[in-house]
């Protein structure tokens, strides 16, 4: 909000990509002057309260648990801070996605999964029977929504030139533009290994 910088943070304590019936903990940054912190979900431009925490003197960042994740709980979340009757602040938004609503796509690579820094690899996500119009590539353990997204079918994700940080387990998901927070089951996993050394044995997981 104008003049109210920096914007308070909101974060998921685990991945914001949550399986159906799973759970996630959301943390709102504590605002000193707020007497009440509310977690809101935004659906069709309407704000609905999910939970509230009154201020306590031993203030820590208020946490909210979203459990039994489903289509109704997927979407954009925001922390609303009540400073007074007519004074509020708002955090940034956090997007939560629910998975397991459609059949899983298939993830494949155009080369071997052990790479040297600087090399390129392309991962392809496809679905033979479900006409998804969007695909997302997710890396296991990431605490933010996948940055890699494609509107093509099949979807090609170019990872490169790679560095050591690219190492990890990858899965892809299919979804529809009209329901951007409802994703498919995860695809098969591919483990990419980026190494300086070519003298070790690596196995790939599929």
């Amino acid at each position: 909000q104008e003049g109210d910088f920096p914007m308070p943070f909101i974060s998921a304590k685990s991945s914001p990509v949550i399986p159906l019936d799973g759970s996630v903990k959301i943390q709102c940054q504590a605002i000193r002057e707020a007497y009440l912190t509310q977690l809101m979900i935004i659906k069709n431009s309407t704000y609905r309260e999910i939970g509230r925490r009154l201020k306590f003197w031993n203030e820590t960042d208020p946490e909210f648990v979203i459990d039994h994740m489903d289509a109704n709980k997927a979407g954009r979340y925001q922390c609303q801070y009540r400073i007074g009757h007519y004074r509020f602040r708002y955090s940034d938004t956090l997007e939560l996605v629910v998975t397991g609503l459609y059949g899983k796509p298939f993830l494949s690579a155009d080369r071997g999964l052990v790479l040297m820094p600087g090399e390129n690899i392309s991962l392809t996500c496809s679905s033979a029977h479900i006409p998804f119009d969007r695909f997302s590539l997710a890396k296991e353990g990431e605490l933010s929504l996948p940055q890699h997204q494609s509107g093509e079918h099949p979807a090609n994700f170019s990872l490169g030139p790679v560095d050591l940080n690219v190492s990890g387990i990858y899965r892809c998901y299919g979804w529809y533009n009209r329901s951007p927070y409802l994703w498919s089951f995860p695809s098969n996993a591919l483990e990419l290994v980026v190494t300086d050394s070519i003298h070790q044995d690596y196995t790939t997981q599929n």
């Epitope: 909000q1 104008e2 609303q80 007074g84 009757h85 007519y86 004074r87 509020f88």
Partner: antibody, heavy 122, light 112 residues
């Protein structure tokens, strides 16, 4: 500059409905609250409602529940006051006023529309 | 509700002379954020209200320096150092600390 421009005067019969608009310009609409204030002829100012323009949630006094609908069209930076089943005592000038919402000093300043005169008469 | 009491009801002043009006609230207007949400408005005859002072003493843009607001807690004052013809109208104080917002009954400034 900051402006709140309200719709024109209205002449209605008892039982009818009126919808008054207040179009804001010169600032980010969602960052400041919107108020509606009633002034009956020859009387003082009476606060009706405050709308959190960020969420669209209205807060109003018991005197203005039921027949009164406070709404927003955020994309058009416009607030609306709708009064259903009009009564003679609704005859007044209605003002919108920007105030509140943020925690900055700017949010504590008030800006007023020019007013909309509503006459309810059979 | 917080009651805002303005005195006097009517103030008759000669042009060039000072004027002072009072606004008292039934509860302290100091909010938990340390601010006091007390504003003053002027409503000239046939016009919409115009903001003069916000947060007790801060002058709104375009408001002449002859207007000053002061006070704290429950007692507030608006002073005009030298009244001009354009100052006539009804002056309202209002509070935005407590729900619901409430206005004073107004002080009518007339020119003698």
């Amino acid at each position: 500059q900051i402006q709140l421009v309200q719709s024109g005067p209205e002449l209605k019969k008892p039982g009818e409905t009126v919808k008054i608009s207040c179009k804001a310009s010169g600032y980010t609409f969602k960052n400041y609250g919107m108020n509606w204030v009633k002034q009956a002829p020859g009387k003082g100012l009476k606060w009706m409602a405050w709308i959190n323009t960020y969420t669209g949630e209205p807060t109003h006094t018991d005197d203005f529940k039921g027949r009164f609908v406070f709404s927003l069209e955020t994309s058009a930076s416009t607030a609306y006051l709708q009064i259903n089943n009009l009564k003679n005592e609704d005859t007044a000038t209605y003002f919108c006023a920007r105030w509140g919402l943020g925690t900055t000093e700017e949010a504590a300043r008030d800006y007023w529309g020019q007013g909309t005169t509503l006459t309810v008469s059979s | 509700d917080v009651v805002m009491t303005q005195t006097p009801l009517t103030l008759s002043v000669t042009i060039g002379q000072p004027a002072s009006m009072s606004c008292k609230s039934s509860q302290s207007l100091l909010d938990s954020d340390g601010k006091t949400y007390l504003n003053w408005l002027l409503q000239r005859p046939g016009q919409s209200p115009k903001s003069l002072i916000y947060l007790v003493s801060k002058q709104d843009s375009g408001v002449p320096d002859r207007f000053t607001g002061s006070g704290s807690g429950t007692d507030f004052t608006l002073k005009i150092s030298r009244v001009e013809a354009e100052d006539l109208g009804v002056y309202y104080c209002w509070q935005g600390t407590h729900f619901p917002q409430t206005f004073g009954g107004g002080t009518k400034l007339e020119i003698k």
